[in-house]
């Protein structure tokens, strides 16, 4: 089981997470709570930043949190603000950028409590044994060579989204990574939540399709945190 993997320290010095091309700003998946994968549906530059009204951190993008734009401002007016980088002041985990968490009022790297390393080792140990070797980014030849001549169909194993056919992305599922359908309008999606206290989630959903973003369902604003539902909605 995965628990035994959590105790393994066999794999060190990992490359970027499997499934995201090196240097790409975001992974191809809508990662679930606790996973330190950058990426999501709302990568925005400061230039074209549009304030997005919010009530909860979960309504904001991966690299944002929900707060009043002015210190001591009207608590009723909140927007999605850019996350705080390492060593910046914070009041809660969600204020810190992915890969960091709030400790004693300061955003610190998740590396410092071994959280990131533990997760990455777990993923590679349990999902990666059949995947890539860790020197450079070269692949072991255990994957069927056929896979790379024809694009992977739904459910077939993959290393990254480019291995999958059109309309599919490469995402974690059970102990492996497989080609899954890109999400359509109305389908449930996962918002990244950077709270380090969350357990390791080993299911990933693809991102929302073109013209869609992952937003909280309007009728779920009053729902409890645990049942808050996000779906792919038109921009």
């Amino acid at each position: 089981t995965l628990n035994s993997v959590l105790n393994s320290n066999a794999i060190k010095n990992l490359p970027p997470p499997l499934g995201g091309a090196a240097g790409h700003p975001g992974s191809a998946v809508s990662a679930a709570p606790g996973i330190l994968y950058p990426g999501g549906n709302k990568y925005q530059t400061i230039d074209n930043y549009q304030p997005y009204p919010c009530a909860e951190d979960e309504e904001c993008g991966t690299d944002e949190y929900c707060a009043s734009p002015t210190r001591g401002g009207d608590a009723g007016v909140q927007i999605c603000l850019a996350c705080r980088k390492r060593r910046k002041r914070c009041m809660r985990h969600a204020m810190c950028c992915p890969g960091n968490y709030c400790k004693n009022g300061i955003c610190v790297s998740s590396d410092q409590n071994n959280f990131r390393g533990e997760i990455e080792e777990t993923i590679t140990e349990s999902f990666g044994n059949d995947h890539s070797t860790l020197d450079g980014y070269s692949r072991r030849t255990t994957l069927s060579s056929k896979m790379y001549h024809s694009k992977g169909q739904e459910g077939s194993v993959c290393l990254r989204s480019s291995d999958c056919a059109t309309g599919l992305c490469c995402a974690r599922h059970f102990w492996s990574k497989i080609c899954k359908p890109v999400l359509k309008e109305g389908q449930v999606c996962t918002k990244h939540r950077r709270k380090g206290s969350h357990g390791l989630e080993i299911f990933q959903r693809c991102y929302c399709g073109e013209g869609l973003s992952c937003r909280i369902q309007k009728d779920h604003h009053q729902a409890s945190n645990s049942s808050r539902l996000h779906t792919c909605q038109r921009h």
Epitope: D130, S144, K146, G155, I178, F203
Partner: antibody, heavy 116, light 111 residues
Framework: QVQLVESGGGLVQPGGSLRLSCAAS????????MSWVRQAPGKGLEWVSG????????HYADSVKGRFTISRDNSKNTLYLQMNSLRAEDTAVYYC?????????WGQGTLVTVSS | DIALTQPASVSGSPGQSITISCTGT?????????VSWYQQHPGKAPKLMIH???NRPSGVSNRFSGSKSGNTASLTISGLQAEDEADYYC??????????FGGGTKLTVLG
Amino acid sequence: QVQLVESGGGLVQPGGSLRLSCAASGFTFSSYWMSWVRQAPGKGLEWVSGISYSGSNTHYADSVKGRFTISRDNSKNTLYLQMNSLRAEDTAVYYCARMGIDLDYWGQGTLVTVSS
Amino acid sequence: DIALTQPASVSGSPGQSITISCTGTSSDVGGFNYVSWYQQHPGKAPKLMIHDGSNRPSGVSNRFSGSKSGNTASLTISGLQAEDEADYYCSTWDMTVDFVFGGGTKLTVLG
């Protein structure tokens, strides 16, 4: 179309061994994880074991750990389950299932009866 | 053992809607936010009906829908038909025991 056909079931005495096979066709077998799931007569489903597409990664339910071994031969498109030290409670229909988006295709199953 | 709890039986008349519940613990249904549903007719192999809580594989009727709230997942079948009579199993994945199946629910279509 995807097809999974199990074989190798039968009557065996407690403590005995049996090897189940599952012949796969209609898809690229070597690109999918595979699983065995069993169902005791009149009971619910119980996941038994899973194996990665190359065979280098295996998982087992606690109830069969150390007694059952899952393996595969990608050149023959065949999945196997070697069952040793069989017990009466292992009596069940054993299904082979493809692990795509969950257990998305199942065989019709083969009955294993452990009785003296 | 971690278990998913389903009602032993549910019944409904043709055309009606029925819902089958599946209750788990925070480490499975609630924690992982991932549930699948399988249909099994007597003497037949199970068939995947819903994955990821609410997604239907191709070929599955849109009369079948899934949802989840907290630690309870639900399968709803609308416009009940005679051929829907079968056993239904929910399933999730747990970090300590891998796959977990519910005990199953026998659906009877009356009349």
